[in-house]
């Protein structure tokens, strides 16, 4: 057992099993579940931390109902197919061949057909809205001092450029935190606003991604920032395609 | 712990090199960044190039250097940096520094090596 | 985005005190480095998160700020503290950018 395997892990993803097989003899972190290769300087895609989810049987978790504006996840756990760089496939089926149409963070964008259904592209969700409420507090957060933090938490944490932060919006206990990035203004290397969206949500519900890390202890000025719930919207560049029975 | 640059010395200008850092007493597949830091004869430090040594390796560069400079890292004990193109500018002191957390944007420097000089001149 | 150190030169007798300043062009909270450098050396690290003293350097180096100012002070000046200060963020790494400060050379009287 050397040092090498000890400096061996991946600090941006628990749900990974890491060794020093790599080229030359350096550190290799696979995903549970699918067995993908990570890149564990940054956060690991939505696709493949949902693949590993599904590898490890946990009490299936139910989400929040849709919102007829955005796309809400609503399906609940899946077991998603990953294109080779952790996208998810456009096309998504589950095992009695059910299909239906993704976005680029993996919610459904179609109504459910069988497998003659084609989906032609990966549309991307370019616009999230999270959608906190806070723990009363005795007195209100200063708005500035809240937007600073959450752009530092988002960097720093999630490794997301600031210019991705599009707006802090708030209204006690109503926070809104907005996430925007166009396919033309994501760069190689730029965090993937779905992935530090879905790293948020499982910091905020107590189910940390990161390895060894205590879980998210946001503070404003010292004074702490609990949150009581959390609901997400996505809005993707090209809208969604369900039947009018499915609004009724 | 100590950090070791070589591949420096003496170029003829549009040619090209490449500088190997090597550490010892410890191994590059941890959960660090390396980067290489230049320094022009009475000048300042002037980023070049970073990379991830553990699962991955991501790669950052400044600006003016892509295209021109690689950074890669083959083997659990060396990063390496390719020059092409090179031209009386690139004359200075090549460094290579750890960064001491897996946080690229979070980084400082907390291990050096001694540095290695570049002349590009005909 | 861009690191503005100031002076770019400052003389001081042997007990005195030296402050030298950072500003960054955008918030970079409390991700900021200090390095001293001695002619034919390289940099070593005395101060990281803006204000943490790192292993071995003295209490008299001490470091303040987070936004977009920052401050170094050497207080109780020694000869050996005669040497070039750099400041240094990564936090925008991913714009290419050079997060070096320019550089202040302190003189010791």
């Known amino acids: 057992h050397t040092a090498a395997q000890d400096n061996c892990t991946c600090p941006t993803n628990k749900m990974t099993v890491c060794s020093p097989d790599g080229p030359g003899g350096r550190c290799q972190c696979r995903a549970l579940g699918s067995g993908v290769a990570v890149d564990c300087s940054t956060l690991t895609s939505k696709c493949l931390l949902l693949k590993a989810r599904m590898s490890a049987p946990k009490n299936a978790r139910t989400l929040v109902r849709p919102n007829e504006h955005a796309l809400v996840d609503n399906d609940g756990l899946y077991d998603p197919d990953c294109d080779p760089e952790g996208r998810f496939k456009a096309r998504q089926c589950n095992q009695t061949s059910v299909c239906w149409c993704v976005n680029s963070v993996g919610v459904r964008r179609t109504d459910k057909g069988d497998l003659s259904l084609r989906c032609d592209e990966l549309v991307r969700t370019h616009h999230i809205l999270i959608d906190l409420r806070h723990r009363p507090t005795a007195s209100a957060f200063n708005h500035s001092d809240l937007d600073a933090e959450l752009r530092r938490l988002f960097r720093e944490r999630y490794r997301l450029h600031p210019k991705f932060v599009a707006a802090v919006h708030y209204e006690q206990p109503t926070i809104q935190i907005e996430l925007r990035q166009n396919t033309s203004q994501k760069a190689a290397g730029d965090v993937d606003i779905g992935d530090a969206a879905y790293y948020f949500e499982r910091d905020v519900k107590g189910e940390s991604l990161f390895q060894g890390r205590g879980g998210l202890d946001l503070r404003v000025r010292g004074e702490p920032l609990q949150v009581e719930r959390t609901l997400i919207y996505y809005l993707d560049e090209i809208p969604p395609k369900f039947s009018m029975k499915r609004l009724t | 712990q100590q950090l070791e640059e070589s591949g420096g010395g003496l170029v003829k200008p549009e040619g090209s090199l490449t500088l190997t850092c090597k550490g010892s007493g410890f191994d590059f597949s941890g959960t660090y960044w390396m980067w290489w830091v230049r320094q022009a004869p009475g000048k300042g430090l002037e980023w070049i190039a970073?990379?991830?040594?553990?699962?991955?390796?991501?790669t950052y560069y400044a600006s003016w250097a892509k295209g021109r400079f690689t950074i890669s890292s083959t083997s659990s004990t060396a990063v390496t940096l390719q020059a092409t193109s090179l031209t009386a500018a690139d004359t200075a002191t090549y460094f290579c520094a750890r960064g001491a957390t897996n946080n690229v944007f979070m980084n400082y420097f907390n291990l050096w090596g001694p540095g290695t000089l570049v002349t590009v001149s005909s | 985005f861009e690191m503005t150190q100031t002076p770019s030169s400052v003389s001081e007798p042997v007990g005195g005190t030296v402050t030298i300043k950072c500003q960054a062009s955008?918030?970079?909270?409390?991700?900021l480095g200090w390095y001293q450098q001695k002619p034919g050396q390289p940099p070593k690290l005395l101060i990281y998160g803006a204000s943490t003293l790192a292993s071995g350097v003295p209490s008299r180096f001490k470091g303040s700020g987070s936004g977009t100012e920052f401050t170094l002070t050497i207080s109780d000046l020694e000869a050996a503290d005669a040497a070039t200060y750099y400041c240094?963020?990564?936090?925008?790494?991913?714009?290419?950018?050079?997060?070096f400060g320019g550089g202040t050379e302190v003189v010791v009287k």
């Open positions: 240094q963020t990564s936090y925008y790494i991913d714009d290419g950018v050079n997060g």
């Open positions: 970073s990379i991830y040594v553990g699962s991955g390796s991501s």
């Open positions: 955008e918030d970079i909270s409390s991700n």
